[in-house]
């Protein structure tokens, strides 16, 4: 008796144990997108970056969707999001057009049910790059701690696209849940 | 024959908790890890910096390993990683041999198993820091969520080491375990 | 006897999980404040912003307190840090009293046991804003990992606090609890 | 080989002015930063002004500050030194050095010129 | 600024001897930025070391130099007879660069 019900019990707190890693694991969805350079479009308007990497290099995705230019929200939670964006020029890609540039970033969070987009962070700088330097660079980083629910669309706006650094380790976002909503 | 069922199964679930409590805090590894200016190298060129504080101030690790100037991952697992660099100069630093500085990190991972290294972010920007101003700064911040197996390596390069901000606030990077690999 | 035993258990593994969800939750603080633009003080120096939202649009609070423009602890823990802080100032604003600014965020952290203030992480840049220029913005994002104690108070010092970005998605800082203290 | 070749002293009066050069070859002048370094008779070492690669930033020590100028012709790969209100304690041979540029920060004088000599009396 | 006071004024050795040339800092040496040169009658110095104790191209090893802080020495295993000159220690880790008044090592 005592002995198949301890069993029994192992048995149990098994799969249970199971369930809860399992379950962990999730509610744990995250993304990691690079930079699909093939793709950037050129003009120095804001514009949406639609191509993204979501599976190769450091790329990579779970319980998340990437779908049309847009990471989607597959479970309700509080996420960290994050954005690195790197712009840079040689002047072997020709000369600016002008020097006074505005290098920016925002990370908007659309909702179909009620189609409205809202920038959730924003980050940048104006700069002066001057034709006495042959080579300029500059990063942007934000990050911040969000509720998203289900079906919500994460997207990435800049500036000056065709001055966007092309590399995995320069031009990427993500994200990763961090707890589920009360 | 209930009670006693009851009292055991208290017992074994309480274990249970303890057991999950402990593991849910092995399996988060983490480490802050400050510049520690005495060691700094000079020169202008991309130079790994191999002198971190991991015990005192701000800084701290738990496990990870910090060995050879490296943050080195004891647990599979996904982590978000970070570095915030900070350079500075003020004119009785000495005269800038030139106002057109790059000011860059490199967040690298190496693995021992097939050696190699690779820029897993990088961030930073062209200054024009002119003599006619008494003090510069600027700060680069990085962060990015990435798969971590054990025995890989992670390192910090900068341009310019000479010119780092040697608090424990301004220069510094690290690492925190967010979920395990499926 | 069998069957009776399964349904308790049952019941008290149902229970458990309630509790490990219920306590899984509760273990994870957060806040997510985003600037007050009523009440931001003016001048170049460096200054406590003390008036920030935390329940309208991105802005939330959970298990933590926000009081006289702290955030404060309520659990001890490992928290993620960050802080988003936007500066920009447009012609039609005035002219700027210098070209060279220093613009800086200091995130602070103060124990009320031992009265005492310490920088966890710095971030910023010195710029040339030239008249030429009708319009300026720079952004600066620090984040880190840091150990909290219960009723320590986490608060943000900026220089230049005329010339912050009032909007949510600009200057805003937060935190999210990782992990409990050994 | 670099070579560093400095002209242009001589005696003048107190008051006076001068204008000192020095012709750089065998390196890409303009990647480098340069200095003027000088000593007295029987003296020792005084740095006494340097300019950064692009000419934009220029750097001088107390003692010559408001009366001397620095500059550089990158076409010409040639440095100068302007002095004017020129004293009696500023009579020293003059060296053009050649910043090393392994550094951002002006640092070690290597090589120098075989300097020229200023002498500053009535 | 940083004042740098060599010591002794004068050395005399014999060839083949070792010199050991101190230079002080008023105030600490950032990041070993410390260089020594070498001047003969009638010539322009020449760099021996810089950062302290990395030997410049072309000099022989006999040279040396070390310390950080305050304090800093040039040493010369074994002095040949071309050696003889003065020396003089140069700092660049704060404006103005400065040099020390000179050490001559004379021989005896």
């Known amino acids: 008796g005592s002995q198949h019900i301890r069993a029994e019990k192992a048995m149990v707190d098994g799969s249970w144990l199971d369930l809860a890693k399992r379950s962990k694991l999730e509610a744990q969805p995250f993304a990691h997108l690079t930079i699909n350079a093939t793709d950037i479009p050129s003009g120095s308007h804001k514009v949406s970056l639609s191509s993204w990497y979501h599976d190769r290099g450091w790329a990579k995705i779970s319980n998340m969707t990437f779908s049309n230019g847009k990471l989607i929200v597959n479970q309700d939670g509080f996420y960290y999001l994050y954005a690195n964006i790197c712009f840079r020029h040689h002047e072997t890609s020709g000369d600016l057009a002008t020097e006074y540039l505005q290098l920016m970033v925002y990370v908007t969070k659309t909702s179909i049910k009620i189609p409205s987009s809202h920038t959730l962070m924003k980050g940048g700088s104006t700069k002066y790059w001057s034709g006495n330097s042959e080579f300029h660079f500059y990063s942007i980083n934000v990050g911040g701690f969000f509720k998203l629910r289900s079906g919500e669309e994460i997207s990435i706006e800049v500036s000056n696209p065709s001055l966007l650094d092309p590399d995995q380790d320069a031009t990427y976002f993500g994200a990763f849940k961090v707890r589920d909503i009360d | 024959g209930s009670q006693h069922i009851r009292a055991e199964k208290a017992m074994v679930d309480g274990s249970w908790l303890d057991l999950a409590k402990r593991s849910k805090l092995e399996a988060q590894p983490f480490a802050h890890l400050t510049i520690n200016a005495t060691d700094i190298p000079s020169g202008s060129h991309k130079v790994s910096l191999s002198s971190w504080y991991h015990d005192r101030g701000w800084a701290k690790i738990s496990n990870m390993t910090f060995s050879n100037g490296k943050l080195i991952v004891n647990q599979d697992g996904f982590y978000y990683l970070y570095a915030n660099i900070c350079f500075r100069h003020h004119e009785t630093s000495g005269d800038l041999a030139t106002e057109y500085l790059q000011l860059m990190v490199y967040v690298t991972k190496t693995s021992i198993k097939i050696p190699s290294s690779h820029t897993l972010m990088k961030g930073g920007s062209t200054k024009y820091w002119s003599g006619n101003s008494e003090f510069h700064f600027y700060s680069i911040n990085v962060g990015g969520f990435f798969k971590l197996r054990s025995g890989e390596e992670i390192s910090i390069e900068v341009s310019n080491p000479s010119l780092l901000d040697p608090d424990q606030d301004a220069t510094y990077f690290g690492a925190f375990k967010v979920r395990d690999i499926d | 006897g069998s069957q009776h035993i399964r349904a308790e258990k049952a019941m008290v593994d149902g229970s458990w999980l309630d509790l490990a969800k219920r306590s899984k939750l509760e273990a994870q603080p957060f806040a997510h404040l985003t600037i007050n633009a009523t009440d931001i003080p003016s001048g170049s120096h460096k200054v406590s912003l003390s008036s920030w939202y935390h329940d309208r649009g991105w802005a939330k609070i959970s298990n933590m307190t926000f009081s006289n423009g702290k955030l404060i602890v309520n659990q001890d823990g490992f928290y993620y840090l960050y802080a988003n802080i936007c500066f920009r100032h447009h012609e039609t604003s005035g002219d700027l009293a210098t070209e060279y600014l220093q613009l800086m965020v200091y995130v602070t952290k103060t124990s009320i046991k031992i009265p005492s203030s310490h920088t966890l992480m710095k971030g910023g840049s010195t710029k040339y804003w030239s008249g030429n220029s009708e319009f300026h913005f720079y952004s600066i994002n620090v984040g880190g990992f840091f150990k909290l104690r219960s009723g320590e108070e986490i608060s943000i010092e900026v220089s230049n606090p005329s010339l912050l970005d009032p909007d949510q998605d600009a200057t805003y800082f937060g935190a999210f609890k990782v992990r409990d203290i050994d | 080989e670099v070579q560093l070749l400095e002209s242009g002293g001589g005696l003048v009066q107190p008051g006076g002015s001068l204008r000192l050069s020095c012709a750089a070859s065998g390196f890409t002048f303009s990647s480098y930063a340069m200095s003027w370094v000088r000593q007295a008779p029987g003296k020792g070492l005084e740095w006494v002004s340097g300019i950064t690669g692009s000419g934009g930033s220029t750097y001088y020590a107390d003692s010559v500050k408001g009366r001397f100028t620095i500059s550089r012709d990158n076409s010409k790969n040639t440095l100068y030194l302007q002095m004017n209100s020129l004293r009696a304690e500023d009579t020293a041979v003059y060296y053009c050095a050649k910043d090393p540029g392994t550094t951002v920060i002006m640092s070690w004088f290597d090589p120098w010129g075989q300097g020229t000599l200023v002498t500053v009396s009535s | 600024e940083i004042v740098l006071t060599q010591s002794p004024g004068t050395l005399s050795l014999s060839p083949g001897e070792r010199a050991t040339l101190s230079c002080r800092a008023s105030?600490?040496?950032?990041?070993?930025?410390l260089a020594w040169y070498q001047q003969k009658p009638g010539q322009a110095p020449r760099l021996l070391i810089y950062?302290?104790?990395s030997r410049a191209t072309g000099i022989p090893d006999r040279f040396s130099g070390s310390g950080s802080g305050t304090d800093f020495t040039l040493t010369i295993s074994r002095l040949e007879p071309e050696d003889f000159a003065v020396f003089y220690c140069?700092?660049?880790?704060?404006?103005?660069?400065?040099f020390g008044q000179g050490t001559k090592v004379e021989i005896k």
């Open positions: 140069q700092q660049y880790g704060s404006s103005p660069r400065t």
């Open positions: 105030q600490s040496v950032r990041g070993r930025y």
């Open positions: 950062g302290s104790s």
